[in-house]
C-alpha cells in the first residue's frame, strides 16, 4: 500500500524554540515514522533536519539547528515505513517573522504599599532577539487577589515599581513583552502573586521637587514627622531601560546624605547633562522608611524651566499680573525658547481656599476680588510640548492688598 504524505504542517516558533506539528494522513497504518529536510534560500540541495528524523510522534523540535533567523527556509516532510511517501513541501518562511515572543521571567519584591517588578526575557541570550534585546518593552495586568478588578499598565521597562497599594494585601499580575519595532506582541507570563507587607512605622518622603537657585539645585520634600534624617540617591534614567543584570547602582548625592531638614542644596555641577531618577529615604535612627516614589529629573529642562517672575497691579476687584522672564544669578533674564503655559494660584490671605487660572498670555487678570483684602499669588510655568511635559516649581508667593471700592477703572 502506498504511504500518503503527512498534511497540515504547522511551524511554531517561540523565542529560540522551533516546534513542528503535523497530521498523520493515514491513522490506520501503524509504526510509521516521519522525517524532515530543510533547504535554505538560494540552495538546490535538501539537508536532513536534525532532531526531526524518524520521529514516531507528530511533533518534533529543531531548536538545535543553528539557523540565520533572518533567512528564508523551506521544509519538506515524508512518512516512512517499509517504503516512503512522497515529500510534502511546507510554505517557505523566515524564522524571525514567524517567531513569537515567549513569556518573560518575572521577579517580585514587596514593600508595604508598593511592589517592585523585575522583568527579563524568558530566554537568556536569545538568538532570535539578539539584535532586539534592548528594544523590549513590557505591559502588565495587575489585580487585587480579592477583587479581580484588573488594571493595565503599558510600556514599562525591565524594572517597574507600582505605588499606592494597600498593606497586607495580595496582588497578582502577569506580564508580556513586545517588540514594537517588529510589531510583535508576546505571550503572557504565568500569574505571579505577592502579598504587601505590614504597614511600615515610617512612611516614605513625599512630593519631591527640584528647583534651581543660583548655581545650585534645591531638592525639597514633605515628611510627616520631625527629628528625622534623610538621604537622597540618584540613578541614570536610561539604566531602567537596560535589561542587564538587575543591579541598579543608585548613588548618594554627597550633600544630601544624613540631612536633618526636608531639603538639601547641591551644586549643579554634581550632574552632567542628562535625565536622572531621584529618590529619598527617611530614618529616625532605629527605623528606616522605604524609598520615596522616584522622580524624573532632566538637567536640561530643570536648568531652563525656572519659576516665572511677575508684577502685580492691584485694583479694587481684581489684580493685573504681568509675567516676565525668570532671572538667573547676576539678574540676567533667562531666554525661554519654547512655548510656555502659566498656572496662577491665588487665595485670600486669611483662607486656605485656592483658586487657579491657566493662561498662555503673559498679562493675566485675576477677577472677582474683594476690596481692601489681602490676596496671595504664586505662579509656575509648564512646557506646552507634550513630549517635554515639564513644570517649573512655584514661585514664592507675593501678597498684595486690593484697593478700596470704585477704583476698577
Amino acid at each position: 500500500k502506498n504511504l500518503k504524505s503527512p498534511q497540515k504542517v504547522e511551524v511554531d516558533i517561540i523565542d529560540d524554540n522551533f516546534i513542528l506539528r503535523w497530521n498523520r494522513s493515514d491513522e490506520s497504518v501503524g509504526n510509521v515514522t516521519f522525517s524532515f529536510d530543510y533547504q535554505k534560500t538560494g540552495m538546490d540541495n535538501w539537508i536532513k533536519l536534525s532532531g526531526c528524523q524518524n520521529i514516531t510522534s507528530t511533533k518534533c523540535n529543531f531548536s538545535s539547528l543553528k539557523l540565520n533567523v533572518y533567512e528564508e527556509i523551506k521544509l519538506r516532510i515524508r512518512a516512512e515505513k517499509e517504503n516512503t511517501s512522497s515529500w510534502y513541501e511546507v510554505d517557505s518562511f523566515t524564522p524571525f517573522r514567524k517567531a513569537q515572543i515567549g513569556p518573560p521571567e518575572v521577579h517580585l519584591e514587596a514593600e508595604d504599599k508598593a511592589i517592585v517588578i523585575h522583568i527579563s526575557p524568558g530566554t537568556k541570550d536569545s538568538v532570535m532577539w539578539a539584535l532586539d534585546g534592548l528594544s523590549f518593552t513590557y505591559s502588565l495586568v495587575i489585580w487585587k487577589n480579592s477583587s479581580g478588578v484588573e488594571e493595565r499598565i503599558e510600556n514599562i521597562y525591565s524594572r517597574h515599581k507600582i505605588y499606592k497599594l494597600s498593606p497586607e494585601t495580595t496582588y497578582c499580575l502577569k506580564v508580556k513583552a513586545a517588540l514594537l519595532t517588529s510589531w510583535k506582541i508576546g505571550v503572557y507570563s504565568p500569574v505571579h502573586c505577592i502579598k504587601t507587607t505590614v504597614e511600615n512605622e515610617l512612611p516614605p518622603p513625599e512630593n519631591i521637587e527640584v528647583s534651581v537657585q543660583n548655581q545650585n539645585y534645591v531638592l525639597k520634600w514633605d515628611y510627616t514627622y520631625a527629628n528625622m534624617t534623610f538621604q537622597v540617591q540618584w540613578l541614570h534614567a536610561f539604566l531602567k531601560r537596560n535589561p542587564g543584570n538587575h543591579l541598579y547602582k543608585w548613588k548618594q548625592i554627597p550633600d544630601c546624605e544624613n540631612v536633618k531638614t526636608t531639603q538639601c542644596v547641591f551644586p549643579q555641577n554634581v550632574f552632567q547633562k542628562g535625565i536622572y531618577l531621584l529618590r529619598v529615604q527617611a530614618s529616625d535612627g532605629n527605623n528606616t522608611s522605604f524609598w520615596s516614589e522616584e522622580i524624573k529629573f532632566d538637567t536640561e529642562i530643570q536648568a531652563f524651566l525656572l519659576p516665572p517672575v511677575f508684577n502685580i497691579r492691584s485694583l479694587s476687584d481684581s489684580f493685573h499680573i504681568y509675567i516676565g522672564a525668570p532671572k538667573q544669578s547676576g539678574n540676567t533674564p533667562v531666554i525661554q525658547d519654547y512655548p510656555l503655559i502659566y498656572e496662577i494660584i491665588f487665595w485670600e490671605n486669611t483662607s486656605n481656599a485656592e483658586r487657579k487660572i491657566i493662561e498662555k498670555k503673559t498679562d493675566v487678570t485675576v477677577p472677582n476680588l474683594k476690596p481692601l483684602t489681602v490676596y496671595c499669588v504664586k505662579a509656575r510655568a509648564h512646557t506646552m510640548d507634550e513630549k517635554l511635559n515639564k513644570s517649573s516649581v512655584f514661585s514664592d508667593a507675593v501678597c498684595e492688598k486690593t484697593k478700596p471700592g470704585n477704583t476698577s477703572k
Partner: antibody, heavy 118, light 107 residues
C-alpha cells in the same frame, strides 16, 4: 563559570596590617558590588562593607570604619580588604561575596583565614 | 542597625521530617531577605533570595516564606546532607546584617 578566588591564609603580628584579595572569574566585577564578611570560629557572620568596583564607592558597617579599607582594581578583576592595627579579635575567616541586586550575595569566595599572633 | 534574630540556635530533626527555621527582623525589610547554608569548613552556600526565590540548583525541598519582619526557611523531607548551619541575611538597608545562625542536627 562564575567564581571568586580568595588569597591564601595569613599569619600576622599584633598591630600589623594585612591585605586580602578576592579575584573574580567568569564575570566582570565592575558590573556588581563586592562585599566582605567576617566569621569568627564557630560563630555567626558579620558584614564588614562593600565596594562598587566601577567607581570605588564604599560602604562600611560602623564597627569596621577605620579598621577595614576596601579597594578594587578592575584591570585585574580583583577586590581587596585591608585590615589595620590587628589584634587577636581579628583572628577569623574573611569571605568575599558578589552582590547581585535582589539576588543578594549569589557567589562567595572560599574564605581566607587570618591568624594574629606574636 | 537592623537586628536579625534567629531564636533557635540548635534544632534537632530526623531524616524525612519537615523543619522550620525562623528569623525575625527588628524592622520592616520588605522581602529583602536571603538564606544561606554553611557546612563545617565551607563557605556559605546561597539557598534563597528575596524571601522565597530558590537559587538555581537548590533542591525544591527548601522553601522560603514571610515578609516584613517575620521570615521562615522550611526544609521538607530533611536529608542527612542538610546537616548544616542556616543564616538569614537582610539586604534592605546598610549596614547589612545576618542572623546568629541555626544549627540543624540530624538525630
Amino acid at each position: 563559570e562564575v567564581q571568586l578566588q580568595q588569597s591564601g591564609a595569613e599569619l600576622v603580628k599584633p598591630g600589623a596590617s594585612v591585605k586580602l584579595s578576592c579575584t573574580g572569574s567568569g564575570f566582570n566585577i565592575k558590573d556588581y558590588y563586592i562585599h566582605w564578611v567576617k566569621q569568627r570560629t564557630e560563630q555567626g557572620l558579620e558584614w564588614i562593607g562593600r565596594i562598587d568596583p566601577e567607581d570605588g564607592e564604599t560602604k562600611y558597617a560602623p564597627k569596621f570604619q577605620g579598621k577595614a579599607t576596601i579597594t578594587a582594581d578592575t584591570s585585574s578583576n580583583t577586590a581587596y580588604l585591608q585590615l589595620s592595627s590587628l589584634t587577636s579579635e581579628d583572628t577569623v575567616v574573611y569571605y568575599c561575596g558578589r552582590y547581585h541586586g535582589y539576588w543578594a550575595l549569589d557567589y562567595w569566595g572560599q574564605g581566607t583565614s587570618v591568624t594574629v599572633s606574636s | 542597625d537592623i537586628v536579625m534574630t534567629q531564636s533557635q540556635k540548635f534544632m534537632s530533626t530526623s531524616v524525612g521530617d519537615r523543619v522550620s527555621v525562623t528569623c525575625k527582623t527588628s524592622q520592616n525589610v520588605g522581602t529583602n531577605v536571603a538564606w544561606y547554608q554553611q557546612k563545617p569548613g565551607q563557605s556559605p552556600k546561597p539557598l534563597i533570595y528575596s524571601t522565597s526565590y530558590r537559587y538555581s540548583g537548590v533542591p525544591d525541598r527548601f522553601t522560603g516564606s514571610g515578609s516584613g519582619t517575620d521570615f521562615t526557611l522550611i526544609i521538607s523531607n530533611v536529608q542527612s546532607e542538610d546537616l548544616a548551619e542556616y543564616f538569614c541575611h537582610q539586604y534592605f538597608s546598610y549596614p547589612y546584617t545576618f542572623g546568629g545562625g541555626t544549627l540543624l542536627e540530624i538525630k
